[in-house]
């Protein structure tokens, strides 16, 4: 970086090298060049010469003032015009940064995805800080009082094997950067209450051409949890509003859910589950598309969607799992 150059003087910043975005700052340059009484001192920001707000303080020192500095990073250097020198002489350089102290982390959430072997903790970090911000996740056993700390720059995966202090814990998050430090509220968890069942997946759909055509959605999960509650949501792709059906489910066999849908319309389905009575849901599954036939029965199997229709035949169509804004990984 610019800080590695050989200096013939000094460049510095008030109040500090890294400062709160929007502050008024002063950058000073002091020349110490042999046999040179600088005629002029120049400041450069990201290689571009600054023309305004420069004040000469004395024979060797000048100040550049910025009002409401809003750039996250800038490389500053200053030069001197020395008598009898054709080119400007480099004095020194410095990288400066501006940003914000961290917000208080909130919405601290810890879940154990079944079979993952990890407890995953996430939180809302708040506004962008623009500068390096670290998080320390504190996990304290309510049974042994033992506390463990994990350093991260985003979320954290904690091996469940390392949670040896029983089932009940307090979890909280500290956020810190060069401009400040904040701490979240404490979250109390019980390991048995935060398990999210293995992902539910829609495998295929078929429409049976009865007096009233009905569509059967086949879906399954590898979960070993006995009592599972699920929701399936569906809508015509042209609609904004989802319809939601609720199920109490036992995944010892593939689930079949029946829907009475309008003919010749493309529908989208998603499913999510939670351990019955617990707090956290799976994220919604990938989007599963199925177009109801006009009159002919239709099977949609899990592959890529072709939307091809052969008259009088049952044709396999393939469903892609597109992610849309409606498919956020919500676990609340």
């Amino acid at each position: 970086g610019i800080t590695n150059i050989n200096c013939s003087g000094h460049i510095w910043v008030e109040p500090a090298t890294i400062f709160k975005m929007g502050m008024n700052i002063s950058i000073y340059c002091q020349a110490a060049i042999k046999n040179c009484q600088p005629r002029k001192l120049h400041f450069y920001k990201n290689g571009i010469k600054e023309r305004f707000q420069i004040t000469r303080i004395n024979k060797t020192t000048a100040r550049l003032w910025y009002k409401n500095f809003l750039e996250p990073h800038a490389s500053m250097y200053c030069t001197a015009e020395c008598p009898k020198h054709f080119q400007e002489t480099l004095i020194c350089g410095k990288d400066i940064s501006s940003g914000y102290p961290p917000d208080i982390p909130d919405e601290v959430t810890c879940v154990i995805y079944e079979y993952s072997g990890n407890m995953t903790c996430t939180w809302n970090a708040g506004k962008l800080t623009y500068i390096d911000t670290k998080y320390v996740v504190h996990v304290k056993s309510l049974e042994t009082e033992e506390e463990q700390q994990y350093l991260t720059s985003s979320y954290i995966n904690i091996s469940t094997d390392s949670l040896q202090g029983g089932k009940k814990y307090l979890v909280w998050v500290q956020a810190a950067n060069a401009l400040g430090m904040e701490e979240s509220k404490q979250l109390q968890i019980h390991l048995d209450d935060i398990v999210i069942p293995s992902a539910a997946v829609i495998s295929r759909a078929e429409t049976i051409n009865a007096t009233v055509p009905k569509t059967i959605i086949y879906w399954d999960s590898q979960t070993t949890i006995e009592k599972v509650s699920c929701e399936m949501r569906y809508k015509a792709t042209t609609n904004q509003t989802w319809n939601v059906k609720e199920f109490d489910t036992n995944f010892t066999y593939v689930q079949q859910s029946e829907f009475y849908l309008e003919p010749n319309i493309k529908y989208v389905f998603q499913v999510r589950c939670q351990e019955t009575g617990k707090r956290y849901w799976q994220p919604w599954s990938s989007l599963f598309f199925h177009k109801t036939p006009e009159t002919v029965p239709q099977v949609t199997s899990k592959a890529f969607q072709h939307d091809t229709w052969n008259s009088g035949l049952t044709v396999a169509s393939i469903s892609t799992g597109h992610l849309t804004s409606d498919n956020r990984g919500d676990i609340g």
Partner: antibody, heavy 117, light 107 residues
């Protein structure tokens, strides 16, 4: 030669305020900022805040935010630090210091503030 | 806030000894580190700025080194007037913070 001369010792009651002055001479007062640093008896140094006299810009340590006010009077080359809602733990030697090269190269002689009921 | 940790907190040494004091920042502060000497009843005196630059008028037996998070103040040959408390201070970000101090005493 730059000199920073501070006001005399103060004895204050808990809950009251104190205002310490720091007069600069022998240099361009408005060219550089002034910081305030305190030192409790037998303890280390603690930065309280900074003012850029020419621009009136201030920056305070979070710990003192809301209780400290730093001001400057260019016409008299004097900086002031006012600390309110005093408590016994504010008993300390209060220094003004001038930052140069991002370090404090000139210091006042210190003002002892004693908070006692 | 950036925490500054000095070690040792105190040391005993004799005149002529080489003395080393270390200062560690809780995160990288590039070279924005200063060293001060303070004697009882006196204001601190700047020795080293920008990690390794000697302040004018300070004897050359004082030197500073380091960058990032780890810094060192060295007194190459301790003199009687060097018995004092030494502080490091970061000027990388506000609040500006000091180490807790290292007291150099006569052995």
């Amino acid at each position: 030669q730059v000199q920073l001369v501070q006001s005399g010792a103060e004895v204050k009651k808990p809950g009251s305020s104190v205002k310490v002055s720091c007069k600069a001479s022998g240099g361009t007062f408005s060219s550089y900022g002034i910081s305030w640093v305190r030192q409790a008896p037998g303890q280390g140094l603690e930065w309280m805040g900074w003012i850029s006299a020419i621009f009136g810009t201030t920056n305070y340590a979070q710990k003192f935010q809301g209780r400290v006010t730093i001001t400057a009077d260019e016409s008299t080359s004097t900086a002031y630090m006012e600390l309110s809602s005093l408590r016994s733990e504010d008993t300390a030697l209060y220094y003004c210091a001038r930052p140069l090269k991002q370090a404090f190269d000139y210091w006042g002689q210190g003002t002892l503030v004693t908070v006692s009921s | 806030d950036i925490q500054m940790t000095q070690s040792p907190s105190s040391l005993s040494a004799s005149v002529g000894d080489r003395v080393t004091i270390t200062c560690r920042a809780s995160q990288s502060i590039t070279d924005d580190l200063n060293w001060y000497q303070q004697k009882p009843g006196k204001a601190p005196k700047l020795l080293i700025y920008a990690a390794s630059s000697l302040q004018s008028g300070v004897p050359s037996r004082f030197s500073g080194s380091g960058s990032g998070t780890d810094f060192t103040l060295t007194i190459s040959s301790l003199q009687p007037e060097d018995f004092a408390t030494y502080y490091c201070q970061q000027s990388y970000s506000t609040p500006l913070t000091f180490g807790q101090g290292t007291k150099v005493e006569i052995k």
